[in-house]
């Protein structure tokens, strides 16, 4: 039994809905009495959902799962998975049983986009050209790691000087706190990017310093 | 057959400095965050450094290494580098290179080289 | 920096015996720990990651348990392949990421 699932993972921001696609050809005259639909989590077997004897045996996974059962007859042995959370991430196996027998296992990517970063600037008064300033970049509750890029007011690249610590933090989101260390010049616009890989999605922040005072677009 | 392959190690004189190299191959490079873990003669292992997947990606590193080392990587080769300069008889020890457990994440090291063996001594 | 203590330095069982392994969080770090299974003169392998989620390959005998910082390693039954070095690693914080100072199982 040839059972198919999308080759791609299957992105979902964090508290959305996610439907895993799962699909079987019955052959004619096929009956979902003779169905056995078996999901579960790919490395620990943990069984997420299931539907045997005509029945839908409802949820083991916090009940959070939902199957499609105006579409199991026409071979759509789909799984809904409802207000996804960081710990969803993985691997799930879709093992389809009616005489013959077949599984697939599709990959849950889940993620959440960083806030908009906040720029603080220390020191952040009577400052001069020549001054070193610490310029700190804080995005919370993203998810995947983020890369974090910094870049002046000409849009190059700042990379010396750098430290960027991300922490997971109860819900497995991430904060990102990113320092740089500049020496100021006249003046000057430093900007900081917080980039999710997987969402492809940049979150900008910036302070520009013009002797007095500083603004923070 | 997922891969890393390092080379670069040598004997090298205190204050000198050695390039390694981590060849990946049988998995899609650019989506991994890659380390560089050390393990000194019969002692445990110990994080060097660290970069995140992009081109030119964040560079992380060990107090013990920041301003000597700097770690790199080439999407297109492949390829993830560790330049070791001013290097000390403390940083003798067996390198490897390792890539996270799942793609755009940097926790857990299921894939390891070999270990390419660097030497400090006068 | 997140400093990881592992207990007992080394541990002296016979083949067959179950094994118990602990690394302690010097602050909170939920799940975020891997376990790590090194033989002389090979590269680490990745056992248990989150805490208690078994690797790819990784037998059944191999658990681990805890969260927040208290953590364990369980083989079940020691068969003559276990006997290694054994290291905890955090990743809820960093860099940097941390190792433990490693658990040795040798043969009694």
């Known amino acids: 039994l040839e059972v198919q699932v999308p080759e791609d993972p299957v992105v979902a921001l964090v508290g959305t809905d996610a439907t895993l696609c799962c699909s079987f050809s019955p052959e004619p005259g096929f009956s979902l009495a003779q169905l056995n639909l078996i999901w579960q989590l790919t490395d620990t077997k943990q069984l997420v959902h299931s539907f045997a004897e005509g029945q839908d045996q409802g949820s083991a996974y916090a009940n959070r799962t939902a199957l499609f059962p105006d579409l199991l007859a026409q071979g759509n042995a789909s799984l809904r998975l409802q207000r996804v959370r960081v710990a969803d991430e993985g691997s799930f196996t879709c093992f389809v049983s009616i005489r013959d027998f077949g599984s697939a296992a599709v990959s849950l990517q889940v993620a959440a986009p960083y806030s908009k970063p906040s720029m603080t600037l220390e020191p952040n008064k009577d400052l001069r050209p020549g001054d070193t300033v610490t310029i700190t970049c804080s995005s919370y509750r993203g998810y995947p790691e983020a890369e974090v890029f910094w870049q002046d007011g000409q849009g190059v690249p700042l990379t010396g000087n750098v430290t960027t610590s991300q922490m997971a933090n109860e819900q497995g989101l991430f904060d990102v706190h990113s320092v740089l260390r500049v020496v100021l010049g006249a003046n000057g616009t430093y900007s900081c990017l917080v980039r999710n890989p997987v969402l492809q999605q940049d979150a900008h922040g910036s302070v520009t310093i013009t002797g007095q005072p500083m603004t923070f677009p | 057959e997922v891969q890393l392959l390092e080379s670069g190690g040598d004997l090298v004189q205190p204050g000198g400095s050695l390039r390694l190299s981590c060849a990946a191959s049988?998995?899609?490079?650019?989506?991994?965050?890659m380390s560089w873990v050390r393990q000194a003669p019969g002692k445990g292992l110990e994080w060097v450094s660290g970069?995140?997947?992009?081109?030119?990606?964040?560079?992380y590193y060990a107090d013990s290494v920041k301003g000597r080392f700097t770690v790199s990587r080439d999407n297109s080769k492949n390829t993830l580098y560790l330049q070791m300069n001013s290097l000390r008889a403390e940083d003798t020890a067996v390198y490897y290179c390792?890539?996270?457990?799942?793609?755009?994440?940097?926790?857990?090291?299921?894939?390891w080289g070999q270990g390419t063996t660097v030497t400090v001594s006068s | 920096e997140i400093v990881l203590t592992q207990s007992p330095g080394t541990l002296s069982l016979s083949p067959g015996e179950r094994a118990t392994l602990s690394c302690r969080a010097s602050?909170?770090?939920?799940?975020?720990l891997a376990w790590y299974q090194q033989k002389p003169g090979q590269a680490p392998r990745l056992l248990i990651y989150g805490a208690s989620s078994r690797a790819t390959g990784i037998p059944a005998r191999f658990s681990g348990s805890g969260s927040g910082t208290e953590f364990t390693l369980t083989i079940s039954s020691l068969q003559s392949e276990d006997f290694a070095v054994y290291y905890c690693q955090q990743y809820n914080n960093w860099p940097p990421l941390t190792f433990g100072g490693g658990t040795k199982v040798e043969i009694k």
């Open positions: 602050q909170s770090i939920r799940s975020d």
């Open positions: 049988g998995f899609n490079f650019s989506s991994y965050w």
């Open positions: 390792g890539r996270d457990r799942s793609p755009y994440q940097y926790r857990s090291m299921d894939v």
């Open positions: 970069i995140s997947i992009s081109y030119g990606g964040n560079a």
